[in-house]
Amino acid sequence: EICGPGIDIRNDYQQLKRLENCTVIEGYLHILLISKAEDYRSYRFPKLTVITEYLLLFRVAGLESLGDLFPNLTVIRGWKLFYNYALVIFEMTNLKDIGLYNLRNITRGAIRIEKNADLCYLSTVDWSLILDAVSNNYIVGNKPPKECGDLCPGTMEEKPMCEKTTINNEYNYRCWTTNRCQKMCPSTCGKRACTENNECCHPECLGSCSAPDNDTACVACRHYYYAGVCVPACPPNTYRFEGWRCVDRDFCANILSAESSDSEGFVIHDGECMQECPSGFIRNGSQSMYCIPCEGPCPKVCEEEKKTKTIDSVTSAQMLQGCTIFKGNLLINIRRGNNIASELENFMGLIEVVTGYVKIRHSHALVSLSFLKNLRLILGEEQLEGNYSFYVLDNQNLQQLWDWDHRNLTIKAGKMYFAFNPKLCVSEIYRMEEVTGTKGRQSKGDINTRNNGERASCESDVLHFTSTTTSKNRIIITWHRYRPPDYRDLISFTVYYKEAPFKNVTEYDGQDACGSNSWNMVDVDLPPNKDVEPGILLHGLKPWTQYAVYVKAVTLTMVENDHIRGAKSEILYIRTNASVPSIPLDVLSASNSSSQLIVKWNPPSLPNGNLSYYIVRWQRQPQDGYLYRHNYCSKDKIPIRKYADGTIDIEEVTENPKTEVCGGEKGPCCACPKTEAEKQAEKEEAEYRKVFENFLHNSIFVPRPE
C-alpha cells in the first residue's frame, strides 16, 4: 500500500499506527517532538521498504533504535530533500544506534546525524555502500567513539561475522548494531543489488530482491515501477510520477491537491505528471493538462484579498515575487530601508499590469520608480476618490519616475495626481502625461507646479566632456566648465561612475534615499583658474572593463522662489586598457607515452583583455634519487616517508609541555596555534550549523491552531 504524500508524526507516539500496511511512503516521513518517553517495542512496520523523499527524526524521547520500527526499510530515494539531506537524525536524546540494518541505498542527498548524545555505531557503518558520495555527510556532536566501544557481531568470541571495508584508512568490520552486520553484495554483482543469499538481482532492482535476476522480484526499483515490474523508463502513454513510478493520464488527471495550484490540477510535461508547469512554461489553457513555453517571462496572476496591497517593507514586497499581473491596487509607502531599490526591483520588477490604481505616498526612501521596471499598463478598473488611478503624494526624495526613453506605460482609465514631491521636476510629470496617454485628463490642480520640483535644479543644461584618457586602471576625463547666470550659484561637480558591461544603465539604477547607490561618487572642486576645465583622475579601476561615467553640477537650487538651471552630462561609456592576464588555472600534466606530456589548464580568472594565445614553457628536471633506493620488485613493504617524529595524541595531553624545537627529538610539541584559515573554517562551520538548525525549526514548528 502506498501512503503519502508525506507523513508527519508528532506529539503522540500512537500516531505511528498511521504507518501500518504502508509499503512505500510517497513523500517524506517525519517522526518528531514526542517528549514523553514511551515503549516503542510494540510498534513494528516490517512492510515499509521505501521512502521516496527523506526521513527526519527529531526529539523523540525513549526511542533507542530504528531497527525494530523499520526492519525492512531498504531505500530512501531523496527525490525531495530536507536541506540537502535524505536522512536527518537530530537531537534524538535516547537513540543508541541507527539499526536500519536493511538500508542499502540512499539514491540522492546526504545524511545529517547531529547532537544525539547517546548515539553509537556510527563509525561501524560504511556509508559509501549506501550513498554515491559521502563527502557531504555531516556526522557531528554524537557520543564520542571512545565512549561507545562499538563491537560488531562475533568480535568478542573471535568469530567475526561481518565483512570488512576501509574507511579513512581504517580496515574494519561493518555493522549496524551489536547483532546486525552491514550487508554487502559480492563483488561479482558490481553495482547491482543482491538477495539475502548473495545472488545478484536484476539490474533494474535497487537495494535488494526476493529472487535473482528477476525484474518483478525487486524490493525497490533503480528507475521506475510500473504494473509490478521495474522498468528503465516509463512505457508509452504512462508518465513519471514522484520520481519512482509510472502512471497513466487518468491517474494524473484525478490527483487532488490542497496546494497553491489546485484550482487547475496536475499537468503532464516532458513525460512527467507534475503539480505545475516548470519554470518557463505555462498551461495551454486553464483546463489543459499540458504545458507550452512562455513568450518572455511566464504570466503569474497575483491577487490581494483586501483589494489593496500595501508595500511598506521588503517583506511585503516579497509576496509579489514573480507576479506579472497584479489584480488589485498598489499602495507604496516606503519610508526607510536598506538597499531598498534593488530589493524592490527583485520582488516587484516583473509586474507588467496593475488592474486597479497605483498610489505612492510618504515614500521618502525612493529616488525613482524604476524598480517597477516592467510596468506597462495600469488599467484603473478601481480608482481613488476623484477618479485617480496614479497618485503621487509627499515623496521627499523622488527625482525620477521612469526613464521615458526606454519605457512604454499606458494608463487606460483614470487621472494622475502629483503634489508635495519637492525633488520631482514638473517636466518629468509632463513627460509621463504624454507617454501614458493621460494628457488632457488632469485638471489644473492635479499637477501642482509650485510644490513639485521646488527643491530640484530642474531645467538642466548639458555638460559636455572635452577629453578622455585611459590606462589599464585609470581614466582621466575633463568637461566644459559650466557657467550659470550667476557664477556664485555653482558650488562644485560630482562625478558618478560604475562598471557597466552593457550600455544600458540609467542614472537612478540601484539608488535610494537611504544611502544605497550602485554608483561610485567623487566630488570635484571648481578649478581656481576660470580658464582651466574641470576634470578628474579615476584610479583603482579594473583593466579591460567598461565603465559608465556621468557628471553633475552641484548648484544652489533656490533663488528667491525662481527655479534655477542645473547641469549634467549624458552617460559616457569608456573602457580601460588591457593588462597582463592573471595566471592560468588548474594546470595539470600527465604522460601518455615515454616521449609525450599532455598539459591541460583553464583560462585565467581575470583575462584583463582579449586572450589571443598562451605560452607554454618546460624544462627537464633531474630525476629524484629517492626513487632508486628501493627495489620495487621485492615483496617487502614500500617504505613510507616519515616527516616528523615525537607527536602524540593531542587529546591525551593534559598540560602542554613546552619544547624549544617543535617536531625535533626533544619531546612532544605544543599544539600549534590555529591558522587564520582554520579559524575561518571553524567560524563557517558554526554558522552552517546555526543555519541548518534555524531551517529545521522553521520547517517543523507550526503555531497551535486557535
Epitope: I2, P5, G6, D8, S257, A258, E259, D262, V702
Partner: nanobody
Framework: EVQLVESGGGLVQPGGSLRLSCAAS????????MAWFRQAPGKGLEFVSA????????RYADSVKGRFTISRDNSKNTLYLQMNSLRAEDTAVYYC????????????????WGQGTLVTVSS
C-alpha cells in the same frame, strides 16, 4: 492533528435526499484534501468522493456519480456531501477523511478520520 466530526446521517426513504456535514478543527482546513468513504454492513471500506483544498476540483466513485455532490466551506472548516436519489445500496456508515497536501486516486489511507455517521436507506 485534525479532529473530524460527521453529522447529518439518519433514516431516509429510497429516492430521498440527505446532506452530511463534517466539521474539522485543528490545522488549516484548506491545506487538506477532504474525502468521504463508506462501509456497508459486512463489507469493506469504499471510496465515495473527494475534493481539493480550494473546492474547485472533485472526484466521485462511479456508483455515486450524478447523484452525490461534494463541497466544502473553508471559512467554516466544514465538508459536505449532498446525497440525492438515494438507494438501498447506499446504506452504510459514512466516514469523513482528511489528507494533507494532496491525494492520489489510489490513496485509501487518509491521514485523519472521523468516527462516522450512519445512513440508512429503507422504505
Amino acid at each position: 492533528e485534525v479532529q473530524l466530526v460527521e453529522s447529518g446521517g439518519g433514516l431516509v426513504q429510497p429516492g430521498g435526499s440527505l446532506r452530511l456535514s463534517c466539521a474539522a478543527s485543528g490545522r488549516t482546513f484548506s491545506s487538506f484534501v477532504m474525502a468521504w468513504f463508506r462501509q456497508a454492513p459486512g463489507k469493506g471500506l469504499e471510496f465515495v468522493s473527494a475534493i481539493s483544498g480550494s473546492g474547485r476540483q472533485a472526484r466521485y466513485a462511479d456508483s455515486v456519480k450524478g447523484r452525490f455532490t461534494i463541497s466544502r466551506d473553508n471559512s467554516k472548516n466544514t465538508l459536505y456531501l449532498q446525497m440525492n436519489s438515494l438507494r438501498a445500496e447506499d446504506t452504510a456508515v459514512y466516514y469523513c477523511a482528511a489528507n494533507p497536501r494532496r491525494a492520489t486516486p489510489d490513496l485509501s489511507r487518509y491521514a485523519y478520520w472521523g468516527q462516522g455517521t450512519l445512513v440508512t436507506v429503507s422504505s
